[in-house]
Every structure is written in structure tokens, then in C-alpha cells.
């Protein structure tokens, strides 16, 4: 089991095994660090991070987002509904993470690592939600055609899509982290 950590997140040489919730928390923070590394390359490479034309591109994307009805916010918090939303959202993000795989020159391995670490996070959460049957898996055919569509965009739109995926994924994970800490 990954080691425990102190408040500074330093690898303590002597540790107790982490609880299931601590492991999930740590895994999400690990992925968030990976997203930060990828965002650095995206923002250095283009001016997308300051662009005001995001709304235009965002309309073409159906990126998972937390809403009031999902029960993940402090007001109207619902553990079961929220957990289903987190897992469903992560499963929906997988096609977008696949799209990112060919979008980075110097950070190719980082993009792969974010994708694989997310697969592990999904495994952790599916165990936590093993009694919940309301989790729908995205249709592979729909995902395949979405991927083809995204890859056929012009360069500017592909850069914007990359930026939006990373930003949305970061926001989704941050919301998930806050919600999971209440569970």
C-alpha cells in the first residue's frame, strides 16, 4: 500500500498502510500534479490559456461537469448519487484522455501516465461503489466516432480542445476530491 504522509506530503520512512479513502485522495492528488505538468506545456506552446474564444470551442465538447443535481456539492450532498457521478464522469473522460495521447511532443509519457493513473483511480472508486448499479459505461462506438471527430479538427481547435480537456479534467477532479473527503 502506498505510504502514509505527513502534512507536508513527504514520504515518511515508517508508515501505516493507508485507508481506502486516503489512497483515493492520494491518487487524485497524484493525477492533479500530472495535469499541472501537462498544462505547463500547453500554456507554453500556445496562448490558449489566455484565450477568450473558449466558449466557442466548448460548445462542441461534452466534457463531464459537476452540477447541483449530482449531489457532490455541500448543499444537497448525496454520497451515493455523487459517487455514481464521479465514476461516470471519469469513464466519460477516458475518451478525452485518449485524445490527449498524440497531443504532446515533450510530455508524451506524462500524458500516458495521467491516462493510466486515471484507470487505477476508476478501479479504486468502483470498489468503493461496488453496490451501486447505476453506473453507465460509455458506448465504445460513440467514443470511437467522437475521437475521429476531435482528431479531424483544424490545428487551432485541436489546441483549444487540449486546453479545455485539461482544464475541465482538473476542475472535475478537484470537485471530486472535495466531495470524497465528505464521504
Amino acid at each position: 500500500v502506498p505510504p502514509g504522509e505527513d502534512s507536508k506530503d513527504v514520504a515518511a520512512p515508517h508508515r501505516q498502510p493507508l485507508t481506502s479513502s486516503e489512497r483515493i485522495d492520494k491518487q487524485i492528488r497524484y493525477i492533479l500534479d500530472g495535469i499541472s505538468a501537462l498544462r505547463k506545456e500547453t500554456c507554453n506552446k500556445s496562448n490558449m490559456c489566455e484565450s477568450s474564444k473558449e466558449a466557442l470551442a466548448e460548445n462542441n465538447l461534452n466534457l463531464p461537469k459537476m452540477a447541483e443535481k449530482d449531489g457532490c456539492f455541500q448543499s444537497g450532498f448525496n454520497e451515493e448519487t455523487c459517487l455514481v457521478k464521479i465514476i461516470t464522469g471519469l469513464l466519460e473522460f477516458e475518451v478525452y484522455l485518449e485524445y490527449l495521447q498524440n497531443r504532446f511532443e515533450s510530455s508524451e509519457e506524462q500524458a500516458r501516465a495521467v491516462q493510466m493513473s486515471t484507470k487505477v483511480l476508476i478501479q479504486f472508486l468502483q470498489k468503493k461503489a461496488k453496490n451501486l448499479d447505476a453506473i453507465t459505461t460509455p458506448d465504445p462506438t460513440t467514443n470511437a466516432s467522437l475521437l475521429t471527430k476531435l482528431q479531424a479538427q483544424n490545428q487551432w481547435l485541436q489546441d483549444m480542445t487540449t486546453h479545455l480537456i485539461l482544464r475541465s479534467f482538473k476542475e472535475f477532479l478537484q470537485s471530486s476530491l472535495r466531495a470524497l473527503r465528505q464521504m
Epitope: 500500500v1 502506498p2 505510504p3 504522509e5 506530503d9 513527504v10 514520504a11 515518511a12 520512512p13 508508515r15 498502510p17 481506502s20 492520494k26 491518487q27 492528488r29 497524484y30 493525477i31 500534479d33 500530472g34 499541472s36 505538468a37 506524462q110 501516465a113 493510466m116 493513473s117 487505477v120 470498489k127
Partner: antibody, heavy 116, light 107 residues
Framework: YYQLVESGGGLVQPGGSLRLSCAAD????????MSWIRQAPGKGLEWIGQ????????VYNYNVLGRFTISRDNSKNTLYLQMNSLRAEDTAVYYC?????????WGQGTLVTVSS | NIQKTQSPSSLSASVGDRVTITCRAL??????LAWYQQKPGKAPKLLIY???HLHYGVPSRFSGSGSGTDFTLTISSLQPEDFATYYC?????????FGQGTKVEIK
């Protein structure tokens, strides 16, 4: 004296199955997570998956997910790796290791060859 | 297999030399890094954990340093039994990943 001893390796055809065992001795087996790690001939190390001390939680690397299953019998101090739908690229030496995030004790390894 | 950058991939050195191997993590991993030594036909052996803590029984000529993304394994005075392949491993998150390895050969 800590000891981990793997067994069950051998030659298997593509699509076949194999179960590896890892017998532990010298430490409180149920108190530790355990991992399986493999090394293809002449290549580096690759983590396969992990099982918690109680056996209640498992997690796998993406390339074996759905094909490999890790289990343990704490009454027998034994760890298992059930490998199904084996492929040529699964050919490797398979190690079991005590898992505290890093791997402080390893078995000697058992060779699995997937070939027709 | 996702791999971190470990360098060099191989090096030639003489007994008594000071040897330094570096490992760069894909992103910030605090000090969740371990180093292993592996000899041909044998299982890896843990040398260093938590970036700089020496595993018990490991000679004091081995030392580790670094945090964040950049890490170093140093052998202060190379001994005949130290000719082997060395791997780094991150355990900040799953899947655990290893460096590609550095083979230390006799000059």
C-alpha cells in the same frame, strides 16, 4: 529471516492460463500488501498489480486488467496470480514482492514463457 | 509501460570510482522514490527508499538524494560487487513505475 518463493511458471500457449504462487515466511503476511512485478527478457521492471493485506482490495496495471487476478490465502501465507488469455508479450520472469509503496523483499522469480 | 527518465542507460567505471546515477520523475513526486540493485539472473534488491533512506543491511557507500522531480543515487567508492543494473521507482501514485535502468559495467 524473510522469504518469498514463487512457483508455477512454465511454458504455455497463447490464449492459455497459468496460476503462479508465492509462499511467504518470516513476517506477518496478513499485515502487508503484496505486489506482482514482471521483467521481460532483457527488459526493465513492470508492476502488474497489488493486493491489500486483508485481500479485500486489488488494483491492476492497465495492460493486465481483466486478464490477471491477484488473490491471497492468509491462512497459508500464500499469494497467487491467476493469468488468463496469455499473450506472447506476457513472457517474463514474474516476481512477488512485499509492498510498502517500495518493495523491500522480493522472491527469486519464476519464468513464464508464452509461445506456440 | 510508462517509464521515468533514468540516466545514463549504462556507464563504465573502475573500482574505487564515485558513481552517480540520476532519475527524473514525470512530475512532482515529493520524496516517494526508491532505488534497487539487480544482478543478472537475480531479483532486484532495495537499496534506498523515501529518496534518501538507506535500507537496512545496505553499505553506507550508497546514498540517495533529491525530491520533487530530480533524484540521484551515488556510490561513493565503487566495489567489485556493485557492478549491476540499478533502477529507480516512484510510489507517489499508481501504477508504480520504474526507470529504464542503468547498467554499471567494469571499465
Amino acid at each position: 529471516y524473510y522469504q518469498l518463493v514463487e512457483s508455477g511458471g512454465g511454458l504455455v500457449q497463447p490464449g492459455g492460463s497459468l496460476r503462479l504462487s508465492c509462499a511467504a515466511d518470516g513476517f506477518l503476511f496478513s499485515g502487508y500488501a503484496m505486489s506482482w512485478i514482471r521483467q521481460a527478457p532483457g527488459k526493465g521492471l513492470e508492476w502488474i498489480g497489488q493486493i491489500s493485506g486483508s485481500g479485500g482490495s486489488t488494483v491492476y496495471n492497465y495492460n493486465v486488467l481483466g486478464r490477471f487476478t491477484i488473490s491471497r490465502d492468509n491462512s497459508k501465507n500464500t499469494l497467487y496470480l491467476q493469468m488468463n488469455s496469455l499473450r506472447a508479450e506476457d513472457t517474463a520472469v514474474y516476481y512477488c514482492a512485499r509492498d510498502t509503496g517500495y518493495f523491500d523483499h522480493w522472491g527469486q522469480g519464476t519464468l513464464v514463457t508464452v509461445s506456440s | 509501460n510508462i517509464q521515468k527518465t533514468q540516466s545514463p542507460s549504462s556507464l563504465s567505471a573502475s573500482v574505487g570510482d564515485r558513481v552517480t546515477i540520476t532519475c527524473r520523475a514525470l512530475w512532482h513526486i515529493s520524496s516517494y522514490l526508491a532505488w534497487y540493485q539487480q544482478k543478472p539472473g537475480k531479483a532486484p534488491k532495495l537499496l534506498i527508499y523515501a529518496a534518501s533512506h538507506l535500507h537496512y543491511g545496505v553499505p553506507s557507500r550508497f546514498s540517495g538524494s533529491g525530491s520533487g522531480t530530480d533524484f540521484t543515487l551515488t556510490i561513493s567508492s565503487l566495489q567489485p560487487e556493485d557492478f549491476a543494473t540499478y533502477y529507480c521507482q516512484q510510489y507517489s501514485g499508481l501504477p508504480y513505475t520504474f526507470g529504464q535502468g542503468t547498467k554499471v559495467e567494469i571499465k
